[in-house]
């Protein structure tokens, strides 16, 4: 019998150029009677210039929803009913053909064409683009609140915020014919729901979103985010109701930046440069493509290329890359956004160079990509640590701690987190290492104590770059290093002469002069650590509520016991700036730590002193046993304790560690054990400092509290943030 | 002084229970875990098991879960261990011990042993 | 469980001599080992905790190697009051196991 076709509603979205007309700034007011009657004649045109060709038998409904600059743009979209085998033959580019066929068929032309009467329509100018009925809802729901503005040359235009009696708004934004559109949101609230969707094209059509960005994020206060040309669109989603916009956003149209480097590197190892996409840290626009070329002084080396929360990883079946596409040396490879650092290494097989090519795949975009490059030894990539093929980075081999993801820097050690005598391979103790006493059996453990060594897990890197060989020799009052440098920035970590209470839980005044107490409206909320003259340091997670991120909140405290009064030796200060770790996940609790900046310089006091910072290859040994300190919770689910309380815990072995938390604890974390399980870190001691007494007197910080099963659990314990894991970047910021 | 004071030797036949004794001077034992340990000539020292005297929590080494209960008095300042059904595999000298830590335990103070003997 | 095995039951040494007791567990135990002394008659007294540790009172001619899963205790210089019977024991993972004893013994 007789089958029905079946019809489908194909949806496309598009601009004209109107040739003989001028744009004027009624068309940017919906309700102008300019606005009404411009519309109503051009989607008379528009109707009937598809009509003219064989689309017309399948032609559904048009509308023109706004205009622009150029002399005259209007924007539209229609809808066509087409048999459903054939959907696939009238694509975006079919059907923009078959148009542009037709107004070039009529441009001499003296017979009367309809859609010709009263528009000049720019063939060069038809651009047809495919959309959905989703698309076109969405954009309908914004044209209550529909802003259109054109932004000239060498301008920065502040964009006006949107109206909040509309639940969506919608910037249609327009630049110069051959410039790049730049925007830049900058999220002024602590906190909100409002979501933002920037877009390559004029309106919201799904297909070609750049970005999406939701509720004032802490992570990316700001964003900039660049169009592949002089055309975006912006549609603001309402979140709760607020008299004050929590955005400011603004446009400039930008030049087109090249993105192609040739580059020679010089003979020399580590970093050498910086490779980016245009105009980084703005979010790369949807049409990037970049190559570089790098040429390596000698097959001896390798290329690195070492990437910031960036991997490249291999794609299965060929799907498209989204968050950027890589090829090197025709090997293809894909973007991905990770809370780590990673590198590639790129062995150099031929001194023809290595090319480097980035491309964005889809107009789904993201924030800039930046890559530090340099050279590695391809016969020794990690000199004096262990090369981790999943990330590409250099790790320390053989120091209690699984670096490297599959763990394998931890695998096939003689001697692990101890020192290997020469002789017969025996294990001490590092602590013996360079202590003036022969352990080894033939001493091995006490040569080459007072000159250079190759550096090492737990060799210590002096400022001149060379290694020495005893561990742990900072501020311990004798120069090892030739610089002298292991004795720089020493004033630190000493107690202050205070009435100690032997035994007692309770400290004294100038016992811990380093403990902040992190306050909200008079409240302690979280403890901290003073380093430097004019930082602390937390957990990162004591700021995980949206309603706890601004500055302007936070109170530090120094020098102060009793939190039910003052005493003369105490200080108090605001916050000037709050850095998370770039990498802190909440979820994992991964690098949770926290730099605050200080209002002003503290003065140092019996009561207020920093505590030392330990060196990346400090080690902390297990067993060793340490002190936390806060005025958190005297029991699981207790009030606050008024008094500073401090706790010894034993530091115990990572991968004990690891085994009792199921395998969640990360390089970046540390553990400690209490006796019984009764002594223990507890809620209001989150950022609290764990501090280790090295062999001077001198206190060093271990780690910072930040999570755990309860409070003292019998067989769980204490996980603090390790301090050495995350000092490059404490000290990256404080210096 | 750290001392750990045992009950003296038992003679005891088999079926029959016996509760040796541990009291502690120069600290309190609810600051630390007492553990047992279990020396028979040939097998060497074996770990039994461990009470909190302060919530009485306990634990037992798999192959003498049933075989004993650990009790403690801190205003005695004393531990317990009950060993019940006893056969002459549990003829061995008891040691109560001190544990320092809470999981990474080893035992630092031992007291002087006591030694059990099954026999009809 | 984790077992502990000290290879020699017993060791013969002179007094004045250096001596090693060497003990290997069944997996990695983390340094976290300890050493006793039981001389005859005597209750167990610990030496070593931590692989590296010496307990209060101890001498210092007693020192101990080890990483991983093996660990030996040495003596630099035996004495005549250091004749005893030797344990290790891991502190790494409950059930706390022991090793089966070494008894250092005057040649």
């Known amino acids: 019998g007789y089958k029905a076709e079946v019809m489908v509603s194909q949806v496309y979205s598009g601009s004209l150029r109107v040739l003989n007309r001028h744009f004027s700034q009624d068309l940017t007011r919906r309700e102008s009677s300019a606005f009404r009657s411009e519309t109503a004649k051009a989607q008379k045109m528009l109707k009937e210039l598809i009509t003219s060709t064989r689309l017309g038998t399948y032609y559904n409904s048009s509308s023109v929803y706004s205009f622009g600059e150029g002399p005259l743009t209007c924007f539209f979209w229609f809808i066509l009913q087409i048999p459903e085998h054939r959907r696939l033959m009238l694509s975006p580019e079919v059907v923009q053909a078959l148009l542009v066929e037709e107004l070039l068929s009529t441009v001499n032309s003296s017979a009367a064409v309809p859609y010709r009467a009263e528009y000049e329509v720019d063939p060069e100018g038809l651009v047809i683009l495919e959309a959905s009925v989703k698309d076109i809802a969405a954009l309908n729901s914004t044209l209550g609140c529909y802003r259109y503005s054109y932004v000239g040359q060498g301008q920065v235009l502040r964009l006006k915020g949107p109206d909040h009696l509309a639940s969506s708004c919608l910037w249609h934004l327009q630049g110069p014919k051959d410039l790049m559109l730049k925007l830049r949101l900058e999220w002024t609230l602590a906190e909100c729901r409002d979501r933002l969707a920037m877009y390559d094209v004029a309106g919201p059509l799904e297909k070609r979103l750049i970005t999406s960005v939701y509720g004032c994020s802490r992570q990316e206060p700001v964003v900039e985010v660049l169009a592949s040309g002089a055309i975006m669109a912006v549609v603001w989603k309402k979140g709760l109701h607020s008299y004050y916009d929590p955005f400011v956003l603004s446009v400039q149209p930008v030049v087109f930046q090249a993105c192609e480097v040739n580059l020679t590197l010089d003979n020399r190892l580590d970093s050498q440069g910086v490779l980016s996409t245009p105009y980084f840290p703005s979010y790369y626009s949807p049409q990037t493509h970049c190559s570089w070329h790098l040429t390596v002084p000698s097959l001896d080396y390798g290329l690195a290329l070492w990437f910031d929360a960036y991997a490249l990883r291999r794609q299965k079946y060929d799907l498209p890359c989204t968050q950027g596409q890589w090829t090197i040396q025709n090997r293809r490879l894909c973007g991905l956004r990770i809370l780590q650092p990673y590198a590639e290494r790129i062995p150099v097989v031929a001194t023809a160079g290595i090319t480097i090519n980035f491309t964005s795949q889809i107009s789904l975009t993201g924030p800039g990509v930046r890559v530090h490059y340099g050279l590695y030894n391809q016969s020794d990539p990690c000199p004096g640590e262990f090369l981790c093929s999943v990330n590409g980075l250099c790790v320390p081999a053989c120091d209690g701690v699984k670096d490297c993801p599959n763990g394998l820097d931890e695998r096939n050690c003689v001697c692990r987190a101890t020192f290997q005598c020469k002789e017969d391979s025996t294990c001490i103790s590092l602590p013996k290492v360079c202590d003036g006493q022969p352990d080894c059996l033939n001493g091995s453990d006490e040569e080459q104590c007072q000159e250079g060594v190759p550096c090492g897990t737990f060799t210590f890197q002096c400022e001149d770059r060379s290694c020495v060989k005893k561990p742990n020799p900072q501020c311990d009052g004798r120069p090892d290093c030739r610089d002298g440098s292991d004795e720089e920035h020493c004033d630190c970590g000493l107690q202050g002469p205070s009435s100690r209470i032997v035994g007692g839980a309770v400290s004294s005044e100038g016992e811990w002069p380093w403990q902040a107490s992190l306050q909200v409206r008079g409240r302690h909320i979280c403890g901290g650590a003073l380093i430097a003259d004019r930082w602390v340091i937390t957990a990162a997670h004591c700021f995980q509520e949206d309603s706890m991120a601004s500055t302007v909140l936070w109170t530090v405290f120094l020098g102060k016991v009793w939190q039910n009064s003052r005493w003369p030796g105490e200080v108090s200060f605001k916050v000037s700036r709050l850095l998370l770790h770039p990498y802190h996940e909440e979820d994992s609790h991964d690098y949770d730590v926290a730099l605050l900046q200080l209002d002003h310089p503290v003065v140092r006091s019996a009561a207020v002193r920093p505590v030392c910072l330990p060196a990346r290859s400090h080690f902390f040994e297990p067993g060793l046993h340490c002190w936390i300190t806060g005025w958190g919770a005297l029991r699981e689910g207790g009030p606050i304790s008024n008094a500073l309380q401090k706790v010894d815990v034993q530091l115990i072995p990572q991968d004990l560690c690891s085994e009792v938390y199921r395998y969640q604890v990360t390089p970046r974390m540390l553990c400690a054990g209490y006796r019984k399980g009764k002594k223990d870190a507890c809620q209001g001691d989150s950022g609290g400092p764990l501090v280790c007494k090295a062999l001077s007197g001198r206190w060093f910080l271990a780690g910072l509290v930040s999570w755990g099963l309860g409070c003292g659990r019998p067989n769980y314990f204490g996980v603090y943030t390790r301090i050495t894991g995350v000092i490059s970047w404490i000290q990256q910021v404080v210096t | 002084e750290v001392q750990l004071q045992q009950s003296g030797a038992e003679l005891v036949k088999p079926g029959a229970s016996v509760k040796l004794s541990c009291t502690a001077s120069g600290f309190n034992i609810k600051d630390y875990y007492i553990h047992w340990v279990k020396e028979r000539t040939e097998q060497g020292l074996e770990w039994f098991g461990r009470i909190d005297p302060e919530d009485g929590e306990s634990e037992y080494a798999p192959k003498f879960q049933g075989k004993a209960t650990l009790t403690a008095d801190t205003s005695s300042n004393t531990a317990y261990l009950q060993l019940s059904s006893l056969t002459s595999e549990d003829t061995a000298v008891y040691y109560c011990?001190?544990?320092?830590?809470?999981?990474?335990?080893?035992?630092?103070?031992w007291g002087q042993g006591t030694t059990l003997t099954v026999s009809s | 469980d984790i077992v502990m095995t000290q290879s020699h039951k017993f060791m013969s040494t002179s007094v004045g001599d250096r001596v090693s007791i060497t003990c290997k567990a069944s997996q990695d135990v983390s340094t976290a080992v300890a050493w006793y002394q039981q001389k005859p008659g005597q209750s167990p007294k610990l030496l070593i905790y931590?692989?590296?540790t010496r307990h209060t009172g101890v001498p210092d001619r007693f020192t101990s190697t080890g990483s991983g899963t093996d660990y030996a205790l040495t003596i630099s210089s035996v004495q005549a009051e250091d004749l005893a019977l030797y344990y290790c024991q891991q502190h790494y993972r409950s059930p706390w196991t022991f090793g089966g004893g070494t008894k250092l013994e005057i040649k």
């Open positions: 011990t001190r544990g320092d830590s809470m999981m990474v335990t080893y035992f630092d103070y």
């Open positions: 931590w692989a590296f």
